[in-house]
């Protein structure tokens, strides 16, 4: 069934910034997709097109991207009469029409919006759930429910505390199924809220963009201690492990790292990559830290390689790889990390996201599907993670509706699968292993 009509509009993301929404019509109905947006965008990402008109939304409008869809992409796709199940053909056509390496003509936000809507339409056209359609596109015969990585403590550039490291996450790997993982996550979250209120006061339980807390912690180890305490008080010490997103590029300073980068600059306190690696290793020894994302700067390749070889845990590339096949290939060759953070809007189309995932998995890496800090009510990534069998998803805390939208969709998927539902659990790094 071909596309009858496409209409794009500006809507708002969870931070009150404009983003792109696409309505795609076939004879089977209306299919809607909305594009997420990152707070910090890596320098190697596909370009998110913004208007840069300071008189409107502080320059963050997306009317140009919307116009590209309505005036250029839509007429081309409608006239070509391509079947919505032909995801790769449609994505390739849009990429060729754009003609730039980083999608800077139309904007990755324009191309992705249409790509997501096409994928949703393709599933209905085939009469299968979206996750099953994605599994088919990826060549997967089975589907797997992921372990959620709940970002419950926030630091880094976007938090108003002194904490250098960006995210402290809990992963309920010992849960029997996704529903139990959600229960564990929610109960730990509420215990954490009480623990933080007790130590830092009620104001400290205000939540950030992704639903996590940002108490005025100074030491990164204190973040781990709070998690340990909340997990313990909830009674789940044996079922929950810890993940971190350091976002070290944010405090990389001329070859070294400033863990106190929110204070006035003082080069004498900078530490070397080896010293930072030793700090991580002390965390791994003292707490059940099983995953660290972006432990070093996106171009500090040597530090990545050395750490991944010796740490014995999951080392996730986000700023390092930005879901970019060229960066992933380099990281694979250099053994820089062992897990890809998959963000559909970093690469800008469903097809390329699937290719990036398959490239990582073919090289023995794990893959963690991720939201962005500026999210919408769109639940595409919930179906994506199930269809791609990556076994892990991070889409915020169990708080804020744009985060829960994804988790709730995963609950629905698990319910729909019934006895056929398989939960990644402790195999979250390699859920397809027999």
């Amino acid at each position: 069934m071909s596309i009858l009509k496409i209409h794009a509009r500006e809507i708002f993301d969870s931070r009150g910034n404009p983003t792109v929404e696409v309505d795609l019509f076939t004879s089977k109905g209306l299919f809607r997709a909305a594009v997420p947006s990152g707070a910090s965008t890596g320098i190697y990402e596909a370009l998110e097109l913004r208007d840069n008109d300071k008189t409107r939304y502080m320059g963050k409008g997306v009317s140009k991207a919307v116009e590209h869809i309505n005036k250029t992409i839509a007429p081309a796709l409608v006239s070509k009469k391509l079947n919505v199940t032909e995801q790769e053909k449609i994505d390739k056509l849009m990429i060729e029409m754009d003609g730039t390496e980083n999608k800077s003509k139309f904007g990755a936000n324009a191309i992705l919006g249409v790509s997501l809507a096409v994928c949703k339409a393709g599933a209905v056209e085939k009469g299968v759930p979206l996750y099953r359609h994605i599994a088919d596109l990826a060549g997967n015969s089975e589907v797997i429910l992921p372990v959620p990585a709940f970002n419950v403590i926030n630091g880094g550039s976007h938090a108003g505390n002194k904490l250098a490291m960006q995210e402290f996450m809990i992963l309920p790997v010992g849960a029997a199924n996704f529903r139990e993982a959600m229960r564990i996550g929610a109960e730990v979250y509420h215990n954490l809220k009480n623990v933080i209120k007790e130590k830092y006061g009620k104001d400290a339980t205000n939540v950030g963009d992704e639903g996590g807390f940002a108490p005025n912690i100074l030491e990164n180890k204190e973040g781990l201690e709070l998690l340990k305490t909340a997990i313990g008080k909830a009674g789940y010490t044996d079922k929950v492990v810890i993940g971190m997103d350091v976002a070290a590029s944010e405090f990389f300073r001329s070859g070294k790292y400033d863990l106190d980068f929110k204070s006035p600059d003082d080069p004498s306190r900078y530490i070397s990559p080896d010293q930072l690696a030793d700090l991580y290793k002390s965390f791994i020894k003292d707490y059940p830290v099983v995953s660290i994302e972006d432990p070093f700067d996106q171009d500090d390749w040597g530090a990545w390689q050395k750490f991944t070889a010796s740490a014995g845990i999951q080392v996730v590339g986000d700023d390092l790889t930005v879901t970019n096949p060229k960066r992933i290939a380099k990281a694979v060759n250099e053994k820089s990390c062992n897990c890809l953070l998959l963000k559909v809007n970093q690469i800008g189309s469903v097809t390329e996201s699937l290719q990036a995932c398959k490239l990582a998995q073919a090289n023995g890496w794990g893959v963690m599907v991720s939201h962005r800090s500026g999210e919408t009510e769109d639940t595409f990534i919930a179906d994506l993670v199930v269809g791609l069998c990556t076994g892990q998803i991070k889409t915020g805390a169990p708080c804020r509706s744009e985060r829960l939208a994804k988790y709730n969709q995963l609950l629905r998927i698990e319910e729909e699968l019934g006895s056929k539902a398989k939960f990644a659990g402790r195999n979250f790094r390699n859920p397809l292993a027999k």
Epitope: H190, N191, V195, T229, A230, A234, T237, D286, Y287, P288
Partner: antibody, heavy 119, light 107 residues
Framework: EVQLVESGGGLVQPGGSLRLSCAAS????????MNWVRQAPGKGLEWVAY????????KYNEKFKGRFTISRDDSKNTLYLQMNSLRAEDTAVYYC????????????WGQGTLVTVSS | DIQMTQSPSSLSASVGDRVTITCRAS??????LTWYQQKPGKAPKLLIY???TLPEGVPSRFSGSGSGTDFTLTISSLQPEDFATYYC?????????FGQGTKLEIK
Amino acid sequence: EVQLVESGGGLVQPGGSLRLSCAASGYTFTSCVMNWVRQAPGKGLEWVAYINPYNDGTKYNEKFKGRFTISRDDSKNTLYLQMNSLRAEDTAVYYCAREGFYYGNFDNWGQGTLVTVSS
Amino acid sequence: DIQMTQSPSSLSASVGDRVTITCRASENIYSYLTWYQQKPGKAPKLLIYNAKTLPEGVPSRFSGSGSGTDFTLTISSLQPEDFATYYCQHHYGTPYTFGQGTKLEIK
């Protein structure tokens, strides 16, 4: 100053029941996980159970599950341990212990109350 | 259940000596370990938590180290008031279990 005072111990016959109390003062009772720990004469320490004030969640040493029940009365700032079907091997000093801010560390203990199970 | 094994079970030492007590867990407990001191007829007293952190009021001659499965309590220079029984305890999930204790006696 934090104070924990146990009471309710004494001599009881095998198969009998006893309810131990622990009166807490000097801190916000509802903010801390509370534990019972016991010590048989001349022996080491053995954790019995805890209760979490945030959700009234309880955890027991499997050894005592079904016979012992931990509870609390926040209006009286008091922790309880109901012990049923007592056996000779339950003879011990029973301590209530407050879990500090950080999980799993008992930073304040009562003086203990002796329970003797004998016919 | 996780087993905690202390060694030695008893130890004779003199004032001023450096003393080391070890505690081994039957599986990885990270740094989820606490040390207590108990004197005869008294309740235990928190000495070290998180394997190496001293609470306020505990003298600096006490120190803790280790992570994973092997832990150590060290008293750098024994004082008369240090003669007591010492227990390690894990809190890596329930049931919390204690070591069997190490009795430190005057030589």
